[in-house]
Amino acid sequence: ELLDPCGYISPESPVVQLHSNFTAVCVLKEKCMDYFHVNANYIVWKTNHFTIPKEQYTIINRTASSVTFTDIASLNIQLTCNILTFGQLEQNVYGITIISGLPPEKPKNLSCIVNEGKKMRCEWDGGRETHLETNFTLKSEWATHKFADCKAKRDTPTSCTVDYSTVYFVNIEVWVEAENALGKVTSDHINFDPVYKVKPNPPHNLSVINSEELSSILKLTWTNPSIKSVIILKYNIQYRTKDASTWSQIPPEDTASTRSSFTVQDLKPFTEYVFRIRCMKEDGKGYWSDWSEEASGITYEDRPSKAPSFWYKIDPSHTQGYRTVQLVWKTLPPFEANGKILDYEVTLTRWKSHLQNYTVNATKLTVNLTNDRYLATLTVRNLVGKSDAAVLTIPACDFQATHPVMDLKAFPKDNMLWVEWTTPRESVKKYILEWCVLSDKAPCITDWQQEDGTVHRTYLRGNLAESKCYLITVTPVYADGPGSPESIKAYLKQAPPSKGPTVRTKKVGKNEAVLEWDQLPVDVQNGFIRNYTIFYRTIIGNETAVNVDSSHTEYTLSSLTSDTLYMVRMAAYTDEGGKDGPEFTFTTPKFAQGEIE
């Protein structure tokens, strides 16, 4: 019998609004009051095992006590009613859980989508968190028919997929009801024809065809989604070159009605393009499909669009009446080659004499020529045709080159080595820039590039290294042959020298010493040597520093003390810093030559 509760709390299962007030009443049973010799005065209220202050209690009568909470802030409160029995022992009478939360807000932003081949799905904004189990029900009806409710699942409370098949061209009315223990609200109603909410499947079987006649076009074909029988489609077509990351788009007005093919124009020859396509209802009402799977195609080859860069070198050791000439040219970059290069054709015409033809696979040709003037032409060939010819005059042996470029300068900028010059007054056909790394250990191996005759500023398009001294030569090329070359030295990026100069004495006197040193080898300079500093000191004295111009290789220290040990070292400086050489010691004599103590 004593297992029966000693009383009860009312209300039994309260759900209250957050930040509201709430009162609970504990009513004791007579038999319990008699057994424990207690009444309502003996009631102690507790929340989550903490005693509630007496000020919140109200004794209603001998059997009932109430407790009032103001501004409930906890979501879940365990409230117990207890009595103080013999010896101040607490005896639990009854317990309840106070659940608190918020009523639902009116659902907003209700929208629906019909994914092709699937049933209509609607979603909405459920509003603030209620902290309570809140049920959302999607309601829908035609003017003449109510559809079954769509109850949102607990794990996806703000969307619901209806049970019925979509019917197009009949308006449907849709709204959402939200309900929990604290209230029920309804969204605004929306009324629409489901055809305006369609998200088509993406076009499929996208394929790409090239044209043998036109190297600038690719035709796309695809299979439209089945929804094309219900709605007129429009498309987005995007494309990019295989290695690019950004997409270009076909103007939407060109693809504004249902079709199953499209020819993309103004493409580059012999280039791989990647395409993708999506579609939607042509009036823009509804949703874009996902993008199709990508498809790629390569535009057809076109003849090379440019003549290769073309130059020559003459072997200085020539036998009488003949000279060895190496003709050299550059491979065209893909965007100018426009296809797979098959070979090169070189023609050599001795002045007003016979023609020699050569077909070459490499990018150089060595020929023995007489000392006469020659005209050389070079064309590059691919599957479609030949480039225009590059023409080069190889002057006669006694040709005197003149008219160099003027004001030649070279400087690093933006991690590139730039070269600029003032153009000669004469009409220049092209410029040849040659460069090589100056080194004491290895010969100067030349790289080169060609620039149009209108250019007077460019950068060297090779793999240049930092801290290397480049000898750059610019040769203007005229109709009758090359002009005089002009050269300049430059660094892509300077660094401090990797070794300092080694200083030695050339002559030591009682009060002066002539120091000498060698110029640093170019391999260790790492930049232009701008100046030297000589540091010298005695064992006990302060160090003295003397700056010396970089053109000097000796210097006289004066005002020295006789019969003294000096330590001297020397540093060389580029624009990026300096490096000390080894320390060297010398002793001044006690007497000058011929002097007696």
Epitope: S207, I209, N210, S211, L214, S216, I217, T223, S260
Partner: antibody
């Protein structure tokens, strides 16, 4: 020389089936889209079916959809039209045509000599 | 679908005449229009593609013009071998590809 030669036409009863073939020569067949076009006696030209060069995309006119199937065998340089549930109104000369394109149009060139299909009731 | 309407349906002309056939599309088709010639018992033959480009091997007396919805085929000086039926065809919005109903050109 680019050539298309159709075969397989003949007389067939309404509701029957027929398979037309087209042998292509003188060009790289697998590079080109192909079509069937028909012409009923004394009438104009009507496009029937299309197939892409790889065979992945096919299209049909509403009048034959669900009854005709276009296919190709690039290894054999051949185009086919499988016709079933034939109707009297399908009676026509059927032409096999190669489709070409530029950036500003798509056109049919050349045309085969045609094969006559007669459907009797 | 795009409808193609040719006019006239038939016409009589004499050798040496200048003849014009027109073709109208039910909506703009840019330059996606082609012209074919068909002689009795023969397959059609391409004359003009992309509205104005003359097919290789076709005599220069044939020319095409137009863009959008209105197109013309002109024969500058009619020759005896030109008497035939002429069809226009659009390939802009496909499928379906659609043809005009044809224009029969006969000797006067």
């Amino acid at each position: 020389e680019v050539q298309l030669v159709e075969s397989g036409g003949g007389l067939v009863q309404s509701g029957g089936s027929l398979r037309l073939s087209c042998a292509a020569s003188g060009f790289t067949f697998s590079r080109y889209e192909m079509n069937w076009v028909r012409q009923a006696p004394g009438k104009g030209l009507e496009w029937v079916a299309y197939i892409s060069n790889t065979g992945t995309t096919r299209d049909y006119s509403d009048s034959v959809k669900g009854r005709f199937t276009i296919s190709r065998d690039n290894a054999k340089n051949s185009l086919y039209l499988q016709m079933s549930s034939l109707r009297v109104e399908d009676t026509a000369v059927y032409y096999c045509v190669r489709e070409k394109f530029s950036g500003t149009s798509d056109w049919f060139d050349p045309w085969g000599q045609g094969t006559l299909v007669t459907v009797s009731s | 679908d795009i409808q193609m309407t040719q006019s006239p349906s038939s016409l009589s002309a004499s050798v040496g005449d200048r003849v014009t056939i027109t073709c109208r599309a039910s909506q703009s088709i840019s330059s996606y229009l082609n012209w074919y010639q068909q002689k009795p018992g023969k397959a059609p033959k391409l004359l003009i593609y992309a509205a104005s480009s003359l097919q290789s091997g076709v005599p220069s007396r044939f020319s095409g013009s137009g863009s959008g919805t209105d197109f013309t085929l002109t024969i500058s000086s009619l020759q005896p071998e030109d008497f035939a039926t002429y069809y226009c065809q659009q390939s802009y919005s496909t499928p379906p590809i659609t043809f005009g109903q044809g224009t029969r050109l006969e000797i006067k």
